[in-house]
C-alpha cells in the first residue's frame, strides 16, 4: 500500500552503547523522506528526526529519561516534497522497530584502565568510571551510577614474559591483586553484567603494561 513512489523502511535496528542510542534502517531514500516516532509501551508517540533523508535517528534523549523502560519506535515514509501525501489507507507507510530496553540491551562500551600502582607485591588497578548520557538532577551519571552492583569488571593480568591470563573480578572500579616481585605485568579489563543473557560483556580495554606511563611503582 502507500503511494507508488514510497517504500516502507525495513531492517530497523537499535545501535546502543553506554545508552547512546541510534535507530538505523534501510533503504537509502530515493524521492522520499522519513520521520521517526518513539514511545514506551504505555506512553504517547513522540516524533523525532522530521522528514529526514538520513537512515538513522539519534533517540538518546528519549531513552535516557528512563533506561529501564521498554521502547518501541516506528519509521514513517513520505514522498519527498509532498509530505502531506498518504497511503491508500489514508496513512503514511511505516514500519515498527523491535522492542528495546536500554538497561538490558545497551552494549557496554570499551572500558579504560585509568591507573595502576604497585606497592611491594600488590598492584591496585583502577578502571575509569565512564560518564553516560543518563541524567539525574541535571548531572550526567557514570556507568557505575546507572548499573550499581549489576556491573562488574573482569581484570586479565599476565606476566610480560608469559601468555597465560589470570583473572580477578570486582563490583567496584578497583582491583587489588598479588604479583611476583620484580616481574612486569600487563593488564586488560572487561565490563560484564552477569545478570544479562545477551550483551553481557564489553570489548576489552586497551592493554596497559607496567613500566609504561600509566603506572606508578613504589618499593616498600
Amino acid at each position: 500500500s502507500g503511494t507508488t513512489n514510497t517504500v516502507a523502511a525495513y531492517n530497523l535496528t537499535w545501535k546502543s552503547t553506554n545508552f547512546k542510542t541510534i535507530l538505523e534502517w534501510e533503504p537509502k531514500p530515493v524521492n522520499q523522506v522519513y520521520t521517526v516516532q518513539i514511545s514506551t509501551k504505555s506512553g504517547d508517540w513522540k516524533s523525532k528526526c522530521f522528514y529526514t533523508t538520513d537512515t538513522e535517528c539519534d533517540l538518546t534523549d528519549e531513552i535516557v529519561k528512563d533506561v529501564k523502560q521498554t521502547y518501541l519506535a516506528r519509521v514513517f515514509s513520505y514522498p519527498a516534497g509532498n509530505v502531506e501525501s498518504t497511503g491508500s489507507a489514508g496513512e503514511p507507510l511505516y514500519e515498527n522497530s523491535p522492542e528495546f530496553t536500554p538497561y538490558l540491551e545497551t552494549n557496554l562500551g570499551q572500558p579504560t584502565i585509568q591507573s595502576f600502582e604497585q606497592v611491594g607485591t600488590k598492584v591496585n588497578v583502577t578502571v575509569e568510571d565512564e560518564r553516560t548520557l543518563v541524567r539525574r538532577n541535571n548531572t550526567f551519571l557514570s556507568l557505575r551510577d546507572v548499573f550499581g552492583k549489576d556491573l562488574i569488571y573482569t581484570l586479565y593480568y599476565w606476566k610480560s614474559s608469559s601468555s597465560g591470563k589470570k583473572t580477578a573480578k570486582t563490583n567496584t572500579n578497583e582491583f587489588l591483586i598479588d604479583v611476583d616481585k620484580g616481574e612486569n605485568y600487563c593488564f586488560s579489563v572487561q565490563a560484564v553484567i552477569p545478570s544479562r543473557t545477551v550483551n553481557r560483556k564489553s570489548t576489552d580495554s586497551p592493554v596497559e603494561c607496567m613500566g609504561q606511563e600509566k603506572g606508578e611503582f613504589r618499593e616498600i
Epitope: 552477569p194 545477551v198 560483556k201
Partner: antibody
Framework: EVQLVESGGGLVQPGGSLRLSCAAS????????IHWVRQAPGKGLEWVGY????????YYADSVKGRFTISADTSKNTAYLQMNSLRAEDTAVYYC?????????????WGQGTLVTVSS | DIQMTQSPSSLSASVGDRVTITCRAS??????VAWYQQKPGKAPKLLIY???FLYSGVPSRFSGSRSGTDFTLTISSLQPEDFATYYC?????????FGQGTKVEIK
Amino acid sequence: EVQLVESGGGLVQPGGSLRLSCAASGFTISDYWIHWVRQAPGKGLEWVGYIDPSNGYTYYADSVKGRFTISADTSKNTAYLQMNSLRAEDTAVYYCARDYGSLQVFIDYWGQGTLVTVSS
Amino acid sequence: DIQMTQSPSSLSASVGDRVTITCRASQDVNTAVAWYQQKPGKAPKLLIYSASFLYSGVPSRFSGSRSGTDFTLTISSLQPEDFATYYCQQHYTTPPTFGQGTKVEIK
C-alpha cells in the same frame, strides 16, 4: 535450555594427541567463559584451564601447560581442548563447563563428560 | 596456588542425619567458594555459591557457611538421594582449585 556436550574422547597411546569438542546450546559462548575440568578414575576433580571465547584469553593448570591448548569457534558455539604429548596420568573423564562470570557464581553448568584413556 | 583442604574424605550416615563437611582454604578467598554434588558416572552439580547462597532448584536442606578461611556444607536431614561425593571449590584466584572430595555413604 543450557547444554554442553563433549565429544572426541577415546583410547590414545602415550605421546599421542586428541582433540575434544564442547558444543554449547541455549547460550552464546562468547558471553561467558568455558572451563575444562578432568577427573581421573576414582579420583577428585582437577581444573585444566579456561578460555574467554570473546577474546581468546586462556590460562592452564601447571600439569598441562605447554601440552594442552584451549580454543573456541564462536561461529560454531563450540570450545575445544587440543591435547598433545599425552601421558598415562592424563587418563580421565574430561568435562567442559560454563562459567557464569559473576563475583558469586562460578561454574553453573557442566557437560556429561568424555573419557580419555592414555595407554599402550 | 590456593589449597582447599576438605574433610572428612568419607563419612557414613543414615537417612535423617545432619551431615557437615568442611573445607579450609590455605589463604583468604573471601566468599568465593562453591560446593558441588557428584553422583557416580554423572557430572557435578552446583549446590551452593558465594559460600552460603543456595543455587536455584537445590533443596533447602543444603546450606553453606563461612568462618574466615573455613567453609562448611551442611545437610540438615540426609535424604536417600543425597548419598554422593561433595566438592568445594575456590574461584577467588586463578587457578581455581577443588577440595579432594567427601564421599557420603549409607551407614
